[in-house]
Amino acid sequence: LKGQEFAPSHQQVYAPLRADGDKPRAHLTVVRQTPTQHFKNQFPALHWEHELGLAFTKNRMNYTNKFLLIPESGDYFIYSQVTFRGMTSECSEIRQAGRPNKPDSITVVITKVTDSYPEPTQLLMGTKSVCEVGSNWFQPIYLGAMFSLQEGDKLMVNVSDISLVDYTKEDKTFFGAFLL
Amino acid sequence: LKGQEFAPSHQQVYAPLRADGDKPRAHLTVVRQTPTQHFKNQFPALHWEHELGLAFTKNRMNYTNKFLLIPESGDYFIYSQVTFRGMTSECSEIRQAGRPNKPDSITVVITKVTDSYPEPTQLLMGTKSVCEVGSNWFQPIYLGAMFSLQEGDKLMVNVSDISLVDYTKEDKTFFGAFLL
Amino acid sequence: LKGQEFAPSHQQVYAPLRADGDKPRAHLTVVRQTPTQHFKNQFPALHWEHELGLAFTKNRMNYTNKFLLIPESGDYFIYSQVTFRGMTSECSEIRQAGRPNKPDSITVVITKVTDSYPEPTQLLMGTKSVCEVGSNWFQPIYLGAMFSLQEGDKLMVNVSDISLVDYTKEDKTFFGAFLL
């Protein structure tokens, strides 16, 4: 539409304009959660706060059961930060014992689920080896990018180990999306 | 407003449409800091370049005295990267001496100040333990998310230790916000 | 334009409104790189997938020969993540040999090229020392910020060492931009 001006005229023109303030948007913040167990090679999804403190959902962007539900098709910017923390990593212990030092790792995945499609789609992944020397370690993984989503798509954040997620503050671990 | 078209008509319709180019926006870049005395457990704020090089403020988004001033209420995407660098961390020295290895850390906080509210609000935090083995280390912390802000709110970036901030290049350490 | 409503009237008003869906946008994903010879202190550019899987370009935002071509002037949000991986870093080997432990590093730069300007402009840089103890290490560097670009500007992503880039998955290493 470059160079085309939206000038009022007497003929009916249907331009797909919309008020920015009415676009679907969400910013979710961490809540405390601890796994009783987790299956090998299956990354658990995080649960989020959606209405208290800094968290909000608006304009038909709804949060339910670990999922952000996309209410209309379009291009969305999606982001998440997960702060991990732990005691001395296994890698460090192994190293001290003089055995091969396979590093531990921490991973965040933002996943899209489309009901009509059998397999979830991994949109974004941040993964980092952790081989810390200090007794306590902590660090964030941040992700953000733009994706074309369809109405009804669902977004979730999966992590390699829920028990390492820092759930102590809403500004440390969060998840959001907004229609561009 | 999904499905509602903004079609010109003869009756006065006040649709909250606005030109994207007129939205408040800022990208600030690092300048050399003057380390100021600060109280224990209180992170100092960075000050920024707002008009030279890559830096700019526009459409009533103003920078003054370490703060970005929000000129109108709405949902903003806010981001910052701070690159830190230092010599061997204390943690490393302690470890070599065989004492308990409490890690050092580096932290960035994007803070909102609302004059009518007594306490600043921490919007985003990136915090990382630093227990480096190498003699010189450097690394960035990146943050970005969407928040609902009110006209008159002020944003700043606080860091755990100003003396560790890499101020050498405008592309390494920066701070920005834009109205969605 | 705060307070000015875009109300239809009988006089011709040219308001710079445009449909959000028609704005230039791109999300590019990693492909296997062909390491090219590059001069010392000159970081090679990555090339990208622009149409398969999660990758797309739209509304005159074109990808050609490692560059994203900016089709119209305006403020763009630009982002990239590069995941690096490697074997034990040189720093670690040097340390074990008892020599001075200069750390290795990994660096990502988002660069703007303007034909009328002789030197490329570094918009964003993420750089990190790597001095890992584990035998295999991997970690992402994420960058994102807003810049004022001109029609015809070209964007590329440069890295310190192409051979360390993880090209195995489209969600690990990516590059995108969109007009705000």
Partner: antibody, heavy 119, light 108 residues
Framework: EVQLVESGGGLVKPGGSLRLSCAAS????????MNWVRQAPGKGLEWVGR??????????DYVAPVKGRFTISRDDSKNTLSLQMNSLKTEDTAVYYC??????????WGQGTLVTVSS | EIVLTQSPGTLSLSPGERATLSCRAS???????LVWYQQKPGQAPRLLIY???SRATGIPDRFSGSGSGTDFTFTISRLEPEDFAVYYC?????????FGQGTKLEIK
């Protein structure tokens, strides 16, 4: 299967002391915050206190009436939660339950142990 | 301290009827940390609903929860004879954790 088994209850005189234990199994005990809750005969449920996981500094919190008299501790190596009760009062008579505190998610209760404070 | 007030104190209904219990908080509570329990005489409480609206493992779908902020509701869509018991809400978002005083659901 998650199991919590309380023990150590019994009859004690006012001013006396008692130590309750809770043996946990079926989950990673060290990750989980733990609570004690009590229920006086014929009354409602009352939260007694909580201990956080070691990674969250292992700090404790108590309800006002027991502060300074009761102490919660944990031994992650033995998957055991303890409640040391000193200066007991008749109003401390209750069934004491240990409960997992996983934050969002399903929490589990033991079967309870009866503490009777009477002269 | 967050005070939880349950109403009614006692609810007399017949099997097959719908039961609606209320739990009101003195200040906003994260729905993530709001749970409902059922307790029968001589037994430990049984978790029915966590996160204000999620059914615990093995809980029949006639039990449901809803609400946010300060107002939470627990519903049994169609009462079965074994549902007559005392029901408690609890918040554990802020210390001290608190319980409601309980609602006794009795056979009419």
């Amino acid at each position: 299967e998650v199991q919590l088994v309380e023990s150590g209850g019994g009859l004690v005189k006012p001013g006396g002391s008692l130590r309750l234990s809770c043996a946990a199994s079926g989950f990673i005990f060290s990750n989980v915050w733990m609570n004690w809750v009590r229920q006086a005969p014929g009354k409602g449920l009352e939260w007694v206190g909580r201990i956080k996981s070691k990674i969250d500094a292992g700090t404790t919190d108590y309800v006002a009436p027991v502060k300074g008299r009761f102490t919660i501790s944990r031994d992650d190596s033995k998957n055991t939660l303890s409640l040391q009760m000193n200066s007991l009062k008749t109003e401390d008579t209750a069934v004491y339950y240990c409960i997992t505190d996983r934050g969002w998610g399903e929490n589990y209760w033991g079967q309870g142990t009866l503490v009777t404070v009477s002269s | 301290e967050i005070v939880l007030t349950q109403s009614p104190g006692t609810l007399s209904l017949s099997p097959g009827e719908r039961a609606t219990l209320s739990c009101r908080a003195s200040q906003s509570v994260s729905s993530s940390y709001l749970v409902w329990y059922q307790q029968k005489p001589g037994q430990a409480p049984r978790l029915l609903i966590y996160g204000a609206s999620s059914r615990a493992t093995g809980i029949p779908d006639r039990f449901s929860g809803s609400g946010s902020g300060t107002d939470f509701t627990f519903t049994i869509s169609r009462l079965e004879p074994e549902d007559f018991a005392v029901y408690y809400c609890q918040q554990y978002g802020g210390s001290p954790y608190t319980f409601g005083q309980g609602t006794k659901l009795e056979i009419k």
